[in-house]
């Protein structure tokens, strides 16, 4: 699910245990709190409709994997959050499966259809940016501008989980039209869906578009990473975006296997391994301390591939912050 | 369901401590464990914690002095240099001021004394 | 630094009396609503009387009432028993990026 979240056990898939996913694994939401302002968020996520109650996820057959983690103690939701990523999360304290959340939403299925299998945006610097390009029954197809707004490249962004969206109907350049069939126009979102298979549109493969109306979106990447107060791009105190806020990282942790891995993303060579005290000469970052406990492999090609603690959990002060210099 | 402490014994200042919190009937990777102690006359003392996911949380006065660590049925409590301050009977627990359980052991007497 | 502070530090009653035990934080606690009360007795591990600020624990009589929300709270027994003596402690639930705990100083009531 590109959300990171589901429903587990229910008799559609809009209802049954809550199930969430971090770094790559699938895990439970503790029932600690949850109530139907975070069932609306949860249902409007997954495109089921308004929410209709709070289930006990122990209700919901198989029970949760023995092996498998509760990740969050309490979700604080205003009902208003387009998903639950959104909403006030804390990491768990103490929660065992008898007390796993569920949830059941109204709309067990979206009327629409077709169904295409996924979305990507193609031809673009990462995965964030690019031309709307959908699948349906193993065969790529891109999407035409008529009818396009900013409702949908919004849905796409969170499809994606990249973010809001920034740049929403730029025609794509030449070298980026796409060579598929052109799958749909006339998207009519409301900006509320899961996913774009959610929203009404016409029917597929029957258009008079050509490939230069294709669409191209561009979201907020959510992960970009920057150098600051170094003598060039790369050297400095380590921040990343998140939420369109810049923020520090943590130092517990960090060594030569995440030095290497910033340097590569930035395209600035090879860490040259810092003393700590050349670390220092950065000093302290302010505002949001946004990552804790980075854990890298090194053969990373970006720090967002890394293991670490949820956005905004740490137990560090600015002291802590990492810096890094790379040989430029 | 029950906890115990062990390793409570009389050191020189400065030899480093372990004390371990034994547990049955509780899947650790379930639930949390408290480390509290209580000085000889005095009041409980939150020292830290670690939680069902592995993560560790310390009072800011116990920052360096101690280190909490876990395998399946045990959570070992390291007190890094201890001080003739350290005297006290330590505790496990498991508790969560909105949540009814509470699950305490008898405590285990430490005391650092040259 | 989280503060939980008691007052009294001691109060006497005669049974039959009412105790109040104040507990201030210096934040709020989680959910506004994360703090217990316990009740140790010498030699013992302590006890759990009331939990959620309100909430009384299992077997616990009705004699005791906890109220309050956010950062201040109150401990009340009601027609006091011989064996309420002891030494009565707050205990508050944080989260701030990372989860914590805090004990307030304690009271003692002795029952006269």
């Known amino acids: 699910s590109p959300s990171g979240v589901r429903l587990v056990g229910g008799l559609h898939r809009c209802e049954g245990r809550v199930e969430v996913e971090q770094k790559g694994q699938w895990g439970t939401v503790c029932d600690d709190g949850w109530d139907i302002k975070d069932v609306a968020v949860l249902c409007r996520e997954l495109g089921c409709g308004a929410a209709s109650g709070t289930p006990s996820g122990i209700l919901y057959e198989p029970p949760a994997e023995k092996e498998q983690k509760v990740l969050i103690q309490s979700v604080s939701c205003t009902g208003t959050e387009d998903t639950l990523a959104q909403c006030e999360q804390e990491e768990v304290y103490d929660c065992s499966h008898d007390e796993d959340a569920g949830a059941s939403c109204e709309n067990p299925e979206s009327s629409f259809s077709p169904v295409p299998e996924g979305v990507r945006l193609a031809d673009g610097p990462g995965h964030c940016k690019g031309r709307v390009e959908v699948k349906h029954q193993n065969q790529w197809y891109t999407v035409c501008q008529t009818g396009w707004s900013l409702r949908a490249a919004k849905v796409v962004c969170r499809q994606l989980g990249c973010g809001r969206a920034v740049l929403t109907q730029k025609r794509c350049n030449k070298h980026a039209y796409g060579r598929k069939p052109i799958w749909l126009s006339q998207m009519s979102c409301s900006g509320r869906e899961a996913t774009l298979q959610d929203c009404p549109s016409g029917p597929w493969g029957k258009n008079t578009c050509n490939h230069d109306e294709d669409t191209w979106v561009e979201c907020e990447d959510p992960f970009d990473l920057r150098l600051v107060g170094g003598d060039n791009l790369c050297s400095g105190r380590l921040e990343v975006l998140h939420k369109g806020v810049w923020g520090s990282v943590c130092d517990d942790n960090w060594g030569e296997k995440e030095d290497q891995v910033v340097c590569k993303q930035l395209g600035c060579g090879k860490s040259l391994s810092p003393s700590f005290r050349d670390r220092k000469c950065y000093g302290p970052g302010v505002g949001r301390i946004w990552l804790d406990n980075v854990r890298c492999s090194g053969e990373e090609q970006s720090l967002e591939q890394c293991q670490h603690r949820f956005w905004g959990f740490h137990d560090c002060t600015h002291q802590e912050d990492v810096a890094v210099i790379c040989s430029g | 369901q029950s906890v115990e402490e062990s390793g409570g014994r009389l050191v020189t200042p400065g030899t480093p401590l372990t004390l371990t919190c034994t547990v049955s009937g509780i899947d650790l990777s379930s639930y949390a464990i408290n480390w509290v102690r209580q000085a000889p006359g005095e009041g409980l003392e939150w020292i830290g914690m670690?939680?069902?996911?592995?993560n560790t949380y310390y009072a800011n006065w116990a920052k360096g002095r101690f280190t909490i660590s876990r395998d399946s049925t045990t959570v070992d409590l390291k007190i890094t240099s201890p001080t003739t301050e350290d005297t006290a009977t330590y505790f496990c627990a498991r508790f969560y001021a909105g949540r009814s359980y509470s699950l305490w052991g008898q405590g285990t007497l430490v005391t650092i004394s040259s | 630094e989280l503060d939980l502070t008691q007052t009294p530090a001691s109060v006497s009653a005669a049974v039959g009396g009412t105790v109040t035990i104040s507990c201030q934080s210096s934040e709020s606690v989680y959910k506004s609503n994360y703090l217990s009360w316990y009740q140790q007795k010498a030699g013992q591990p302590p006890k759990l009387l009331i939990y959620a600020a309100a909430t009384l624990a299992s077997g616990v009589p009705s004699r005791f009432k906890g109220s309050g929300s956010g950062t201040q709270f109150t401990l009340t027994i009601s027609g006091v028993q011989c064996d309420d003596a002891a030494t009565y402690y707050c205990q508050g639930t944080y989260y701030s990026s990372g989860w914590y705990n805090a004990f307030g100083g304690g009271t003692e009531v002795v029952v006269k």
């Open positions: 670690i939680s069902s996911s592995d």
